[in-house]
Interface confidence: low
């Protein structure tokens, strides 16, 4: 016996989030892994007094303690609908079925005399049917439904007389059923029997407040189990050759401060006082844990040396329950001021360390949903995925000997103190119906798939490819708005005067009269932050730099009456100096952010984008920029993420759609102006960039979620893409969905009606498709009332905790970008596509491993889209160059311009043009390739100010 569980809270220093296996493991379970599902008799059988069944303490407790619950008769009626349960088991394809025998159904008053024939027949029929189906029965003798007569006559488990009566009952079961049962559980979760039955009074028999009674009950439960184990071991195991254990339940707990030894001590005490209370005598040294003995000496019974010897080792495997009953409500004593956690993997590690690596059967695991949830139990899928992933990691990475898993529960039923207010079944049962049909929930479909694949064998992404992007591919980096320096930071050579310093000892400069020096013209390098930009860009080794102009700086009045020439000069310098390094610019004219609309003040005060005249003002501004910078800039983005302005214009859906309409018009006017006036001479290309995250159904088994995913894309991307790329009008699906809600009185929103002239204006006003892609969202349908864009979509988002995510909870789902690119091509035809922003926030200031991982994986998927799907992908712009203070850390450089290691990673991908085969020699010609000029680089860095 080792007893070293507390070591689990000393965190593994090798944990790295980008080793995805430590978050979610795509792997299979061991070959003969035992997949099962369970129920408790009282929860599902119903028929509480049918065919001679006696009352249990729970039947009595329901009538006396639980308000609004008449009986368990309204449950799933498994006693009547045995065939339906068997069909449900067939559907899922389990290897075993764990169920409990109702003691009072066999022996109405608890005493073993002549068994109730109908009860005996029911269990015998069930066992025969399971054997016939090759489903192994795991039978629990006691799942809380003590015959009421034993409670009334003896005081229930407080009285050690029950030990022998329980042993008689067990003996009968072994005799009658042991030929067909190879796995026995004596008692299900004795902690809850003792603590809630006699401590909190939340469970039957509903006694509370007597701590001595709580530990007496626990003591008798342990002794009863031990007696039955020895009985089975001596008299039945030799010829029945089965195994027997007791199911022990627990929570898990994490210290408030992971380095604090006192907090760790409290966590250990917490686990010991719940799980150790029963596990230590049975799986440990035969006695209660030392901490409990010291703390509870006045109420905790004592095991004699002979009894310790008798208790020790009385389980053939460790049966472990990890579910809501041990978490809600968790008494304050067990928490000890620390943090309750659902980390099953760590709980299993604790058992491994504390009890010398036993074989473990997870005898109950699952969570619950609200009773209103019927078959679409989406969150249950993710809870199951998370738990199963943790079990798989425990087996594969921690070498824990888990041999089986019991999903809980087969059916919706009576949930103890929660009665019928929650559901735990994988099959939905309408308790008010007569036929009690078992309808598979999404979680049943999911579990079925897990069993069929014996784990998580289906990787969502295809294997990595080797290959290269084309020679003219744009390798870019994106920056948000560049604020122009209003005055050159270095006035050196522009002032003709000569000065003497400290001539009179006052430490001031004194001008020397009568002397005039030669000045020199202003230079781009007079702007200090341009120098910084160029140094960063040179280190990035990119071919393209995307940045945004500040409209409000260029045109402070919003019209051409006051042009800030200095700002335009600054931007021209950024572009021209970049070109000297072989870095072309992609310039964004307007880059609003959630915090800052970025409009000139007068336009902002005139209702901003709710005012159609803003579109005309934008056209004038665009024309000025094309005129001043267009000879150097060949790629233009008019507006960055207009589809995200709904975050700002969100007072109503009509505001959102009105603003979007004016943004579309603004873009189209600018594009038409470029097309007519500037394209012939400048030969550039103009588009707008859309925020384009991919969407997947949160619940792949729910048709409504598939429709919600498509609807997300319609409302998010097609909203702008359809009018510009395709029809000149909003997507029919989006228009109809909003209209449908309008008709039902669920929303007063309406998409603007476009005139024929507007449709002609909008249609075809893009030269390429520009997408900002960061993540994939998991969406579900939820009918929402209200007249805002967000509620018009009827969409809710789900965070999958098993996925690698950033500090701002952006999930790393590389295959989403490939799906997006294919979707765009399928919907809008074969056109040039640029990913104009793509990146992730990473807390690391130096070794930003998450960003490297993200870049490598996402670029792999983009390469697949290019090589396999033949998508015309022309460029990838990583987001972003430098981070901003106190904002999520998206930058390759810190806010004080320190380089992170992801830069070298990106350099390598760029210089390789992707992920080439070993010794690949497909080089680009010198003119096509952006060769790095070391002299240029040197000059950039050393240029004097």
């Amino acid at each position: 016996f080792s007893g070293d569980g507390r070591a689990i809270w000393s965190k593994n220093p090798n944990f790295t989030p980008v080793n995805e296996s430590q978050l979610f493991l795509y792997d299979t379970f061991p070959k003969n892994f035992f997949w099962g599902i369970g129920t408790g008799a009282l929860q599902v059988e119903g028929s509480w007094k049918k065919d001679g069944k006696g009352p249990s303490i729970w039947d009595h407790f329901i009538h006396t303690h639980l308000k609004n619950v008449s009986s368990t008769n309204g449950s799933s009626d498994s006693y009547i609908f045995l065939e339906k349960d068997l069909s449900a088991l067939d559907f899922i394809g389990v290897s075993f079925y764990q169920f409990s025998i109702s003691w009072p159904r066999l022996f109405p008053d608890g005493i073993v005399t002549v068994a109730n024939a109908k009860g005996l027949q029911y269990y015998s029929t069930l066992l025969d049917a399971l054997v016939l189906r090759n489903i192994e029965p795991i039978v629990t003798l006691y799942h809380w439904d003590l015959p009421l007569a034993l409670q009334e006559k003896y005081g229930g488990w407080k009285n050690d007389t029950i030990i022998d009566i329980f042993n008689d009952y067990a003996t009968y079961c072994f005799q009658m059923f042991g030929d067909r049962v190879k796995y026995w559980i004596t008692i299900h979760n004795p902690y809850l029997v003792a603590w809630h039955g006699y401590g909190t009074g939340m469970h039957a028999p509903g006694e509370k407040g007597n701590l001595a009674a709580v530990y007496t009950v626990g003591h008798n439960l342990i002794k009863a189990h031990s007696k039955v184990w020895h009985n089975y071991n001596t008299h039945f195991r030799p010829h029945q050759k089965g195994w027997l254990s007791i199911t022990l339940g627990s929570h898990w707990i994490e210290p408030n401060r992971s380095e604090n030894t006192m907090d760790i001590f409290k966590c250990q005490q917490s686990m010991v006082s719940v799980l150790g209370w029963f596990a230590n005598p049975i799986h440990g040294d035969g006695d209660y844990p030392e901490g409990m003995r010291k703390k509870l000496f006045s109420v905790l019974p004592i095991f004699s040396e002979a009894e310790k010897h008798e208790m020790r080792g009385t389980a053939d495997f460790f049966a472990f329950s990890f579910g809501p009953n041990n978490f809600k409500p968790l008494n304050t004593m067990a928490k000890m001021g620390q943090n309750v956690s659902l980390n099953l993997r760590e709980a299993l590690n604790w058992i491994k360390l504390e009890y010398n690596n036993p074989r473990i059967l997870i005898a109950e695991n699952g969570w619950f949903t609200d009773s209103r949830v019927k078959t679409e139990d989406t969150t249950a899928i993710y809870m199951m995925k998370n738990f199963l992933s943790q079990v798989l990691q425990a087996i594969r990475l921690d070498e824990i000997r888990v041999f089986g898993y019991t999903a809980w529960s087969l059916l919706d039923g009576f949930e103890w103190q929660d009665a019928y207010t929650i559901r735990r079944g994988l099959f939905y049962v309408d308790f008010n119906s007569k036929q009690k049909e078992r309808k598979p929930k999404s979680s049943a479909h999911y579990y079925k798939q897990i069993i069929r694949e014996n784990g998580f064998s289906l990787k969502e992404s295809t294997p990595d490819v080797q290959g290269q992007f084309p020679c003219d591919f744009s390798w870019g980096v994106t920056e948000s708005v560049l604020k122009p320096e209003s005055v050159a930071s270095s006035p050196q050579f522009s002032d003709p005067h000569l000065y003497v310093w400290n001539a009179t000892g006052n430490r001031l400069l004194h001008r020397v009269e009568g002397v005039r020096l030669k000045t020199r013209p202003a230079q781009c390098t007079d702007f200090v932050n341009i120098k910084k930009q160029l140094e960063m860009l040179a280190r990035m080794k990119v071919t393209h730099y995307r940045f945004a102009l500040d409209w409000a700086s260029v045109l402070p009045t919003g019209n051409l009456s006051a042009v800030n020439r200095q700002a335009l000069r600054y931007y021209r310098c950024v572009v021209s100096e970049g070109l000297k390094l072989g870095i072309s610019a992609m310039v964004t004219l307007y880059y609003p952010t959630h915090a800052h609309l970025g409009l000139p003040e007068p336009l902002l005060h005139a209702d901003g984008w709710l005012n159609p005249s803003t579109a005309e003002a934008f056209q004038a501004y665009a024309g000025l920029c094309f005129q001043e910078l267009g000879d150097l800039v060949k790629l233009w983005i008019t507006i960055n993420e207009p589809n995200r302005l709904s975050d700002i214009y969100n007072r109503s859906g009509n505001d959102t759609y009105g603003a979007a309409h004016n943004l579309l018009v603004a873009h189209a006017l600018a594009w038409r102006l470029y097309d007519r006036q500037f394209r012939p001479s400048q030969r550039g290309a103009v588009s707008l960039s859309l925020h384009a995250d991919w969407a997947e159904p949160a619940n792949p088994y729910a048709d409504s979620h598939w429709r919600a995913a498509e609807r997300f894309l319609q409302f998010e991307i097609a909203w702008f893409a359809e009018p510009l790329f395709k029809t000149g009008d909003y997507p029919a699906a989006m228009r109809e969905y909003i209209a449908s809600k309008h008709r039902r009185g669920l929303s007063s929103s309406a998409l603007p009606r476009l005139t024929e002239a507007e449709r002609r204006l909008l249609k075809g006003t893009v030269d390429f498709c520009a997408l900002n892609h960061f993540t994939t969202r998991f969406v579900m349908h939820e009918q929402l009332a209200g007249s805002r864009y967000d509620s018009d979509r009827d969409i809710q988002f789900l965070q999958d905790i098993t996925r690698l995510s950033s500090p701002t909870r952006l999930a790393v789902i590389p295959w989403g970008v490939r799906k997006l690119l294919r979707w765009v091509r399928r919907n809008y035809g074969d056109m040039d596509i640029y990913i104009t922003a793509s990146g992730i926030d990473d807390q690391a200031l130096e070794d930003d491993r998450l960003r490297k991982y993200y870049l490598g994986k996402y670029l792999q998927e983009v390469l697949k889209a290019y090589l396999i799907d033949k998508v015309r992908i022309k460029g990838y712009y990583a987001f972003k160059l430098a981070e901003e203070k106190s904002k999520p850390r998206f930058g390759f450089f810190t806010s004080d311009f320190k380089a992170k290691s992801s830069i070298q990673f990106y350099n390598k991908v760029i210089s390789s043009r992707g992920f080439p085969f070993e010794n690949s020699s497909s080089r680009c010609s010198q003119t096509q390739e952006n060769t790095e000029c070391t002299v240029c680089l040197f000059l950039v860095q050393k240029k004097p100010l």
């Epitope: 019927k374 159904p697 792949p700 088994y701 048709d703 409504s704 598939w706 429709r707 995913a709 498509e710 029919a732 699906a733 228009r735 109809e736 969905y737 909003i738 209209a739 449908s740 008709r743 349908h781 009918q783 009827d794």
Partner: antibody
Framework: QVTLKESGPVLVKPTETLTLTCTVS??????????VSWIRQPPGKALEWLAH???????SYSTSLKSRLTISKDTSKSQVVLTMTNMDPVDTATYYC????????????????WGQGTTVTVSS | SYVLTQPPSVSVAPGQTARITCGGN??????VHWYQQKPGQAPVLVVY???DRPSGIPERFSGSNSGNTATLTISRVEAGDEADYYC???????????FGGGTKLTVLG
Amino acid sequence: QVTLKESGPVLVKPTETLTLTCTVSGFSLNNARVGVSWIRQPPGKALEWLAHIFSNDEKSYSTSLKSRLTISKDTSKSQVVLTMTNMDPVDTATYYCARSVVTGGYYYDGMDVWGQGTTVTVSS
Amino acid sequence: SYVLTQPPSVSVAPGQTARITCGGNNIGSESVHWYQQKPGQAPVLVVYDDSDRPSGIPERFSGSNSGNTATLTISRVEAGDEADYYCQVWDGESDHVVFGGGTKLTVLG
């Protein structure tokens, strides 16, 4: 142009299994917005829905006939197949397949295209 | 399961307005679709989503739905409108399609 065409035996004997095929053209069965239903109509009687297959391969069956029906699809062949076991003379009817499309509403916006129907007689 | 009730028959003179009802428990919260079926032909969708008309269906066909009754209204009835009319909903609870029992519209004269 969107069309659906039912095919199958004209005559089946009692207790036999009926297999009907619906071949579609003008749209794809794996389009996330499309589902296909089978409906039947005994002579002189009302329409009776039998089964539906959703885009994601989820299936739904009429409660009264569930034990006898199986619906499936072969996307590559653009076919939806319905099998009905243990046929009885009362199953004599015209069998239709029909397409449902999701547009703006929460569910399918009606069955917008129907096949011309195939008449099946059950007799010994 | 959900039940839709239609009158077996409705008669109307040419040029008049015909109203065919479809009753169901709280049907106003469901989307109702209407089909026209002429003898020997497959049904044709004439109104979907309570009140929308597919392209090619005359404006004379309209629908409404509230409370426990949905109504198909055919104004300026013509002889060619004589047919059986069926209402239909999706029972989202069970994912089942439910049809009404059908109404025979007779155009008098």
